[in-house]
Interface confidence: low
Amino acid sequence: SSSPTSSASSFSSSAPFLASAVSAQPPLPDQCPALCECSEAARTVKCVNRNLTEVPTDLPAYVRNLFLTGNQLAVLPAGAFARRPPLAELAALNLSGSRLDEVRAGAFEHLPSLRQLDLSHNPLADLSPFAFSGSNASVSAPSPLVELILNHIVPPEDERQNRSFEGMVVAALLAGRALQGLRRLELASNHFLYLPRDVLAQLPSLRHLDLSNNSLVSLTYVSFRNLTHLESLHLEDNALKVLHNGTLAELQGLPHIRVFLDNNPWVCDCHMADMVTWLKETEVVQGKDRLTCAYPEKMRNRVLLELNSADLDCDPILPPSLQTS
């Protein structure tokens, strides 16, 4: 649903010069932080495109929807939103495009109602494994998060730590089994080359998974079997060449699934036969009539649904002595 719109009548603004005047006093329950717009009726605070370098300390206790987008926060420390009294009603937190490069352990602690978190479009070079779980216990208290939006959080190549970016993100998703209740996970546009095999099995409540616009080449080692609630799986704009029988069977076995496969470089050779047969029969693939071959050259732009077994051949492998250089 769309966020409440800003209007002169419903939002109050705090002038920047008021900030120093109130900083020495405890915040008033309904006061609005400097550089922010607040609507108590909509339970919404917007601190958008203000180049803030830290989370305002004087957020009103009524806040349910908090937009901190387009700022320069850089680091989100432990307890970044911990307040006395706590922000007990904060349910939706949007931190997208705020130049965050480090999210530390426990950054979202003391937010008992936090259901939606959007960290998209931040170059997260250092995402603590305990960013979402808050502790390093093997089993943490369950997080209230239902939606986690992590689109385009990959940092530039020269800012990455000497470790797998996929591994760093997955470690944060799985730590302490805190995200067992997660229903929507978006990981689009992150240059993922692979999906660690254990990640989906440990997120059993997922309804929506968006992996679009990555660089996934294969799903061979990814199991969807446990995701019995999965309703949408977005795999558009990856580097998928073919889906093999095991994956096809698992997807077909999910009762509510809709799969999106557009704009992948499908290789239409003999290995594609099972997938073509499945596509002709299945109803789980949205827009399946748009899927076309990318390779080999002679098959380019052919529609997968229009292929038959005679079209799907593999060139014989020549013995070394007959191969040309």
Epitope: E186, A188, S232, H234, E236, R258
Partner: nanobody, 120 residues
């Protein structure tokens, strides 16, 4: 602007029937699978049924199989849910849903819902 408007709800006795409609506008209705989802008082949203673009395939939650029928008329941009043998546990607000795109917040559209009450 995408709009989904449900109608046809009301009060019905157990064992009775209702037909819900969802009028769609603002997008190419025939290009997208559609679903019905319901939310009973104090409970979470529950998927009820889905139908593919041309209506060639339908799927149902176990709780409504054999009693509910989802259909669509692409010429009229309308989605339907025929509900027979209604039970008290079918009481809920019924929403139609169109997931129109791969991304985002804003690509998953819902109507305002229509209330179905099954009671004697």
């Amino acid at each position: 602007e995408v709009q989904l408007v449900e109608s046809g709800g009301g009060l019905v006795q157990p064992g009775g029937s209702l037909r819900l409609s969802c009028a769609a506008s603002g997008f190419t209705f025939s290009s997208y699978a559609m679903s019905w989802v319901r939310q009973a008082p104090g409970k979470e949203r529950e998927w009820v049924a889905s139908i593919t673009t041309a209506g060639g395939s339908t799927r149902y939650a176990d709780s409504v199989k054999g009693r509910f029928t989802i259909s669509r008329d692409n010429a009229k941009n309308t989605l339907y849910l025929q509900m027979n043998s209604l039970r008290a546990e079918d009481t809920a607000v019924y929403y139609c849903n169109a997931e129109l795109g791969p991304r985002r917040l804003g690509m998953d559209y819902w109507g305002q819902g229509t209330l179905v009450t099954v009671s004697s």
